[in-house]
């Protein structure tokens, strides 16, 4: 008789999840010499241990601590790029500007990027049918808690000038409910971080508005200033041109406003 299985509102665990995590770990540690010491089987065991046999609405940051410990990594604290609702451009940027890092350029972020996972209470099975949705089901689900944990640690590690890429095409350019707005902003350390610089990425070709004056950006400035961190903002009017100039700053197209 088939066991009754909880139906959640979100998509189930990504197919071949264990194999994907293990393969990504091996690939990452091969490419990044400073992480060669990492034992990927132990990483997978710690990852699995965070959510297997646990109720997927009752996951805590403590569940992920063994994984966090194994994935401890030092990135240059002054070369951190945060992003909100504009992941692809942020990743294209760090693929060219190799000495800057998004969370997904670290081992733990790389392992989990774009994946979904959850287990079931009291069974060792992975649930490939459905997983809890953050809004419709519960916020303390395995995926949300993972990203909250790694995002907090990433923000805590930042120093000097921290950059954040924001999507100027969204109705809320800065969204207090995003991971950036709810976790990272509040975990920047004022004794280490001097400035948060926002890069507002324009979508329209002929959009010459100063989106740094947007009410949500002013809200971000207020939150950051109250935390004793300077705030600055830059419009990126032409993201395609910006990437071109990152690739080659000597390019003649970089002589005009990006």
């Amino acid at each position: 008789v088939p066991r009754w299985r909880q139906q959640w509102s979100g998509p189930g665990t990504t197919k071949r999840f264990p194999e994907t995590v293990l393969a990504r770990c091996v690939k990452y540690t091969e490419i990044h010499p400073e992480m060669r010491h990492v034992d990927c089987q132990s990483v997978w065991d710690a990852f699995k241990g965070a959510f297997i046999s646990k109720h997927p609405c009752n996951i805590t940051e403590e569940d992920y601590q063994p994984l966090m410990k194994l994935g401890t990594q030092t990135v240059p604290c002054n070369k951190i790029l945060l992003w909100s609702r504009i992941k692809d451009l942020a990743h294209q940027f760090t693929q060219v500007q190799r000495d800057m890092f998004t969370l997904e350029d670290t081992l733990l972020g790389y392992l989990a990027d774009d994946l979904t996972w959850c287990g079931e209470f009291n069974t060792s099975k992975i649930n490939y049918q459905s997983c809890p949705d953050w809004r419709k089901d519960c916020s303390n689900n395995p995926v949300s808690v993972f990203w909250k944990t790694v995002s907090r640690r990433f923000a805590e590690a930042a120093c000097d000038v921290v950059h954040v890429m924001l999507n100027g095409s969204r109705s809320k350019i800065f969204d207090k409910n995003s991971t950036f707005g709810s976790v990272e902003v509040h975990n920047l350390q004022p004794e280490k971080v001097q400035t948060l610089e926002a890069w507002v990425i324009h979508g329209g070709r002929e959009d010459s508005r100063d989106l740094c004056q947007d009410p949500t950006i002013k809200e971000l400035e207020s939150i950051i200033s109250k935390r004793n961190i300077q705030f600055s903002c830059k419009n990126i009017y032409r993201p395609d041109k910006f990437l071109q100039c990152v690739k080659n700053p000597e390019d003649s197209s970089c002589t005009s406003e990006i």
């Epitope: 070369k79 000038v161 950059h163 740094c212 903002c233």
Partner: nanobody
Framework: EVQLVESGGGLVQAGESLRLSCAAS????????MGWFRQAPGKEREFVAA????????WYGDSVKGRFTISRDNAKNTVYLQMNNLKPEDTAVYYC??????????????????WGQGTQVTVAS
């Protein structure tokens, strides 16, 4: 190619003020990150101040914090260094520097691409 021309150096008494200017040409100024460094005889080049790419945020070397202010006028393609309450130990050649990669804010001289010829600041006690 970016050209940087500093001006405003000179001889002053301790406690007095000076304002250095650095005029940039050859690039869109708003794409550049700007900084000031100084070098005293027999010493390494030392970070003084820099602004972020937007020009709206600034940071300083520990020895000048609270006394020096970096600012920029994008309309004039010029960056300034206002130096107050000068001390004899501020005596050095002051250099303006530009980063083509304006998006990286840094205090490392080797991450700046273009340099001015320098202007001498001498503070007498």
């Amino acid at each position: 190619e970016v050209q940087l021309v500093e001006s405003g150096g000179g001889l002053v008494q301790a406690g007095e003020s000076l304002r250095l200017s650095c005029a940039a040409s050859g690039r869109t100024f708003t794409n550049l990150g700007m900084g000031w460094f100084r070098q005293a005889p027999g010493k390494e080049r030392e970070f003084v101040a820099a602004d972020t790419w937007s020009g709206t945020s600034t940071w300083y070397g520990d020895s000048v914090k609270g006394r020096f202010t970096i600012s920029r006028d994008n309309a004039k393609n010029t960056v300034y260094l206002q130096m107050n309450n000068l001390k004899p130990e501020d005596t050095a050649v002051y250099y303006c520097a530009a980063r083509l990669r304006g998006w990286i804010t840094t205090r490392k001289p080797n991450e700046y691409d273009y340099w001015g010829q320098g202007t001498q600041v001498t503070v007498a006690s």
